[in-house]
Amino acid sequence: SGTTNTVAAYNLTWKSTNFKTILEWEPKPVNQVYTVQISTKSGDWKSKCFYTTDTECDLTDEIVKDVKQTYLARVFSYPAGNVESTGSAGEPLYENSPEFTPYLETNLGQPTIQSFEQVGTKVNVTVEDERTLVRRNNTFLSLRDVFGKDLIYTLYYWKSSSSGKKTAKTNTNEFLIDVDKGENYCFSVQAVIPSRTVNRKSTDSPVECMGQEKGEFRE
């Protein structure tokens, strides 16, 4: 129970890609506002998104402090215009989120093929090392910086003239593959964290093909 006309938030859901992390919830407020708090299992609660009418709160700045920690958030509901009001137990109405461990659960964003370069019968395909919002020593870390060898990439490639596909894996951001001379190939990559049990794979990158306007090398 709570203050008259105030309802507790529900369907608290973490939406996170490459550590950009937003907590979403329902319902759309009618005559009420929300405040979010976040904490690690052993830490203190920190308030964010004070008295908002939004049903989402960007918690990226908090979770990037230690992406391997497990976080819990809670959403407080207050009557609009009377945020001091509390529920019948003397506390504002609130609902807890599921626990969230960014390192294990953030979705892998769609990767991008940065370049491909052919030398003879070899092609070097490079995957862009996407920058995250995780910081160390005042610099933003890349996905590879954060995950290290936990992150691999799978490459799919095929002759433009045929449907037969091949695949390769790398634990860096580069593939060196054998191709037939004089043939054009198309490429698509996927990021994978094999040690995970959920959110293991990204969606495929856009397909890039040799012999197209973009050329054999792109910055």
């Epitope: 799978t154 799919y156 894996k169 094999p194 959920v198 794979k201």
Partner: antibody
Framework: QVQLLESGAVLARPGTSVKISCKAS????????MHWVKQRPGQGLEWIGG????????MYDPKFQGRVTITADTSTSTVFMELSSLRSEDTAVYYC??????????WGQGTLVTVSS | DIKMTQSPSSMYASLGERVTITCKAS??????LSWYQQKPWKSPKTLIY???SLADGVPSRFSGSGSGQDYSLTINNLESDDTATYYC?????????FGGGTKLEIK
């Protein structure tokens, strides 16, 4: 727990086709890659091909290309392998296996396909 | 295609001994190598993944090492239950290729 349950043994005539299945449970097949491996009696293991159920990409060993089709039905968590133009050398046990990215970490119990006239 | 050369093809060893099986790839496979144990009429069982990591439920007597083109599986303190055929697999690029297998028998 993770399980891969393959369809039962098959007896087929030369020149015909077989389609065998592998039903996965305990995980979402879209999160993994799925493969088929051949083992002839008394012989070693031979990779036939694999499929990424998340995007439908299939890859085959050139030795089997044109005769094999690997597909996945994510709604039933089932992976299929169809092998056509059967010959006596196709008599073997066929295993499905899950690929985590680090290994083929779980294997089905195997399906015996016997090609005989 | 990447060729995996596994040796020896067969070996005899005594209880309590230590044995090493090797696999050499025809090119760098970036540690995308795993080891399997297979007993007659059974499915292969994963022992080692990513060249050096022990699979769940596998005794610590088993260990994997190597990088680049050269990899090995070591079994310490052999037990009678280790009688089996062992295979390496490179899955760094398609077509994936297995080694020819090593048949281990305990004297």
């Amino acid at each position: 727990q993770v399980q891969l349950l393959e369809s039962g043994a098959v007896l087929a005539r030369p020149g015909t086709s077989v389609k065998i299945s592998c039903k996965a449970s305990g995980f979402n097949i879209k999160d993994y890659y799925m493969h088929w491996v051949k083992q002839r009696p008394g012989q070693g293991l031979e990779w036939i091909g694999g499929n990424d159920p998340a995007n439908g990409h299939s890859m085959y060993d050139p030795k089997f290309q044109g005769r094999v089709t690997i597909t996945a039905d994510t709604s039933t968590s089932t992976v299929f392998m169809e092998l056509s133009s059967l010959r006596s050398e196709d008599t073997a046990v066929y295993y499905c296996a899950r690929d985590s990215g680090y290994a083929m970490d779980y294997w089905g119990q195997g399906t015996l396909v016997t090609v005989s006239s | 295609d990447i060729k995996m050369t596994q040796s020896p093809s067969s070996m005899y060893a005594s209880l309590g001994e230590r044995v090493t099986i090797t696999c050499k790839a025809s090119q760098d496979i970036k540690s995308f190598l795993s080891w399997y144990q297979q007993k007659p009429w059974k499915s292969p069982k994963t022992l080692i993944y990513y060249a050096t990591s022990l699979a769940d439920g596998v005794p610590s007597r088993f260990s994997g090492s190597g990088s680049g083109q050269d990899y090995s599986l070591t079994i310490n303190n052999l037990e009678s239950d280790d009688t089996a055929t062992y295979y390496c697999l490179q899955h760094g690029e398609s077509p994936y290729t297995f080694g020819g297998g090593t048949k281990l028998e305990i004297k």
